[in-house]
């Protein structure tokens, strides 16, 4: 009786179960009653990452330097190439098909997490007691100067964008 379903890593064709091709190989010819499935390796620029019956391998992703991309991990016959972005840039999507410059945190905001090749800068508002007076992709919020430790007093209060201004203590009492 011909099978109606096949085991894992097999497929049904012409009422018989044939082995799928292993990752890194493509289908050349189905199995027969006399022979196993004919599979052949993907070429150097191609891959297949699953047990399959594909007659063509997939092309490795091209990390286009014109789009700011570079190779993070070279593809094999079983894996695709992984692209990342050049210094100062990050991917626009999870599949990393193009890159954009990291954003800078505006004055009043500091860097919570520095950008990587795959993620953008994460900014956070400077809380009370901290400030940032620059637009930067690296600088965190800095604490206000402590006038007291310098034996000075606050002459001008700090904001999220400016440091406090310290001055000498009023000696007239």
């Amino acid at each position: 009786e011909p099978p109606t379903a096949c085991r894992e890593k097999q497929y049904l064709i012409n009422s018989q179960c044939c082995s799928l091709c292993q990752p890194g190989q493509k289908l050349v010819s189905d199995c027969t009653e006399f022979t196993e499935t004919e599979c052949l390796p993907c070429s150097e620029s191609e891959f297949l990452d699953t047990w399959n019956r594909e007659t063509r391998c997939h092309q490795h992703k091209y990390c286009d330097p014109n789009l700011g991309l570079q190779v993070q991990q070279k593809g094999t016959s079983e894996t695709d190439t992984i692209c990342t972005c050049e210094e100062g840039l990050h991917c626009t999507s999870e599949s990393c098909e193009s890159c954009v410059p990291h954003r800078s945190c505006l004055p009043g905001f500091g860097v919570k997490q520095i950008a990587t090749g795959v993620s953008d800068t994460i900014c956070e508002p400077c809380p009370v007691g901290f400030f940032s007076n620059v637009s930067s992709a690296f600088e965190k919020c800095r604490p206000w100067t402590s006038c007291e430790t310098k034996d000075l007093v606050v002459q001008q209060a700090g904001t999220n964008k400016t440091d406090v201004v310290c001055g000498p203590q009023d000696r007239q009492r």
């Epitope: 064709i13 012409n14 289908l27 050349v28 010819s29 189905d30 027969t32 006399f34 022979t35 004919e38 052949l40 390796p41 070429s43 019956r53 007659t55 063509r56």
Partner: antibody, heavy 117, light 111 residues
Framework: EVQLEESGGGLVQPGGSLRLSCAAS????????VSWVRQAPGKGLEWVGS?????????YYASWAKGRFTISKDTSKTTLYLQMNSLRAEDTATYFC?????????WGQGTLVTVSS | DIVMTQSPSSLSASVGDRVTITCQAS???????LSWYQQKPGQAPKLLIY???TLASGVPSRFSGSGSGTDFTLTISSLQPEDFATYYC????????????FGQGTKVVIK
């Protein structure tokens, strides 16, 4: 029944052209490579070329066949073709089609091509 | 292109004999793409062995294939009357020239 049947052979003059057909039954060209092999009278087997699985299929040829011989297929009709141009006396042979590429699992009975004036 | 040289080109043997046919490649090759065929007069070839040593289903176990590098062997352990035929090796240069080549054949005749 799984089988291959060649047709289109015959007598042709030197310099002439001929198109051989290979009709498949019981299997699908979209998932099977197919090859052409020839055998001159009283001689050994000689690979002509192959076409890979898939709807279009990549083609591979023996160096002597490149440019003169063309393999194609019509997946919907499960028919394989061998277009032979600029035929010479030394192309006289029985032409077989066979399923597969690196190993040939099923063969037709062959069709005889005679190139003579 | 890789050249496959079979030897001997013909051999005389008797029923029950152990017969060895060799196929030598002009360069080292992958055994994955080496096959052996049997052809009887007036018939199409028949696949016996593929991947150098895998026996096609239905082929008697007296046939075996072995070898690596440049030297490959087809062995018939005990020759039977129906084994008198011509035998061919085939190699496909996959991944390089993609060309397939047959050996010139070995004819096994009755002594």
């Amino acid at each position: 029944e799984v089988q291959l049947e060649e047709s289109g052979g015959g007598l042709v003059q030197p310099g002439g052209s001929l198109r051989l057909s290979c009709a498949a039954s019981g299997f699908d060209f979209s998932t099977n490579a197919v090859s052409w092999v020839r055998q001159a009278p009283g001689k050994g087997l000689e690979w002509v070329g192959s076409i890979s699985a898939g709807s279009s299929g990549s083609t591979y040829y023996a160096s002597w066949a490149k440019g003169r011989f063309t393999i194609s297929k019509d997946t919907s009709k499960t028919t394989l073709y061998l277009q032979m141009n600029s035929l010479r006396a030394e192309d006289t042979a029985t032409y077989f089609c066979a399923r597969g590429y690196t190993y040939l699992t099923l063969w037709g009975q062959g069709t005889l091509v005679t190139v003579s004036s | 292109d890789i050249v496959m040289t079979q030897s001997p080109s013909s051999l005389s043997a008797s029923v029950g004999d152990r017969v060895t046919i060799t196929c030598q490649a002009s360069h080292s090759i992958s055994s994955t793409y080496l096959s052996w065929y049997q052809q009887k007069p007036g018939q199409a070839p028949k696949l016996l062995i593929y991947r150098a040593s895998t026996l096609a289903s239905g082929v008697p176990s007296r046939f075996s294939g072995s070898g690596s590098g440049t030297d490959f062997t087809l062995t018939i352990s005990s020759l039977q009357p129906e084994d008198f035929a011509t035998y061919y090796c085939q190699y496909t240069d996959y991944g390089s020239s993609y060309v397939s080549t047959f050996g010139q054949g070995t004819k096994v005749v009755i002594k």
